[in-house]
């Protein structure tokens, strides 16, 4: 059987300051049993954006219904976007380990850029 | 066979504390976030507390807040709700449930139940 | 919070009769709502979950529809044993909130 693979097709996602970005990611598998996570930037100092096991993400929604069994579309969608969110973000597959999950396999990442709003200048005569 | 065992239960007096147990077997207790749900007599189901499985994310309803603490301990396989100020409205069976994975899952497996009773 | 509302309150039903129950919520929780059975004097058991799923054991006679604010409980053919009052819930956003529950009677 094939190893699983997290798929980020989109390199890249431009979204308005203020609109919401999609970011897609899909697993090839179903195994290993474990979790997806979702982080802005990689290594130690990567931030956590959205976490299927625990807590909830107000600003976060997933595009599919994650509490269905044989799901495999880990898409997510980040509301009210601004310029601090841009950066690259990585769907990560965690392994279920004892204590903790173990992470498996990173997708490419997906680079979000934020265009400003354009502001609009009132000119007085 | 999954199971939840409520304790702990008991008739308190007004202000005064108590703390219940739920013992859990027959799963992998830390894969699951837990769930503290009350029903008083003859009313409906009211959700008090829930904690994810390394207790990371704690949530609690208004009505708790400030009295109530949920709290787990994974080695032991046991959640706990450590109940203080208690009021006659916390009169209820308290019931454990488990909720696999994140926030959005349901609670698919009970405990019985133990109740608590807060009278003078 | 998300309200939730529950229709009705109480159902008088004979053996063999389609019986559906109504939850609306306050706002959308997209398909994350949830129905559990309780009988008297036992903990609540979940029957469908995420609107349409039924849960592993719960037989086929019981389903789910809806999303967003609208969702239905149907049990298509009344069996003895279903008689108890039936709960709703949403687990879109804290806190977690339950209907007031259906009571489902004999005729």
């Known amino acids: 059987e094939e190893e699983l693979q997290v798929i980020q097709p989109d390199k890249s996602v431009l979204v308005a300051a203020g609109e919401t970005a999609t970011l897609r990611c899909t697993a090839t598998s179903l195994i290993p049993v474990g979790p997806i996570q979702w982080f802005r930037g990689a290594g130690p100092g990567r931030e956590l954006i959205y976490n299927q096991k625990e807590g909830h993400f107000p600003r976060v929604t997933t595009v599919s219904d994650l509490t269905k069994r044989n799901n495999m579309d880990f898409s997510i969608r980040i509301g009210n976007i601004t310029p601090a969110d841009a950066g690259t973000y990585y769907c990560v597959k965690f392994r279920k380990g004892s204590p903790d999950d173990v992470e498996f396999k990173s997708g490419a990442g997906t680079e979000l850029s934020v265009r400003a709003k354009p502001s609009h200048h009132h000119h007085h005569h | 066979e999954v199971q939840l065992v409520e304790s702990g239960g008991g008739v308190v007096q007004p202000g005064r504390s108590l703390r219940l147990s739920c013992a859990a077997s027959?799963?992998?207790?830390?894969?699951?976030?837990m769930i503290w749900v009350r029903q008083a007599p003859g009313k409906g189901l009211e959700w008090v507390a829930s904690?994810?499985?390394?207790?990371?994310?704690?949530y609690y309803a208004d009505s708790v807040k400030g009295r109530f603490t949920i709290s787990r301990d994974n080695s032991k396989n046991t959640l706990y709700l450590q109940m203080n100020s208690l009021r006659a409205e916390d009169t209820a069976v308290y019931y454990c449930a488990r909720r696999y994975y994140g926030f959005n899952y349901p609670f698919d497996y009970w405990g019985q139940g133990t109740m608590v009773t807060v009278s003078s | 919070d998300t309200q939730l509302t529950q229709s009705p309150s109480s159902l008088s039903a004979s053996v063999g009769q389609r019986v559906t129950i109504t939850c609306g919520a306050s706002k959308s929780v997209r398909t994350y709502m949830h129905w559990y059975q309780q009988k008297p004097g036992k903990q609540p058991k979940l029957l469908i979950y995420?609107?349409?799923n039924l849960e592993a054991g719960v037989p086929s006679r019981f389903s789910g529809s809806g999303s967003g604010t609208d969702f239905t409980l149907t049990i298509s053919s009344l069996q003895p044993e279903d008689f108890a009052t039936y709960y709703c819930?949403?687990?879109?956003?804290?806190?977690?909130?339950f209907g007031q529950g259906t009571k489902l009677e004999i005729k």
């Open positions: 995420s609107a349409s």
């Open positions: 904690i994810s499985s390394s207790s990371s994310y704690i």
């Open positions: 819930q949403q687990s879109n956003e804290p806190p977690y909130t």
């Open positions: 027959g799963f992998t207790f830390s894969d699951y976030g």
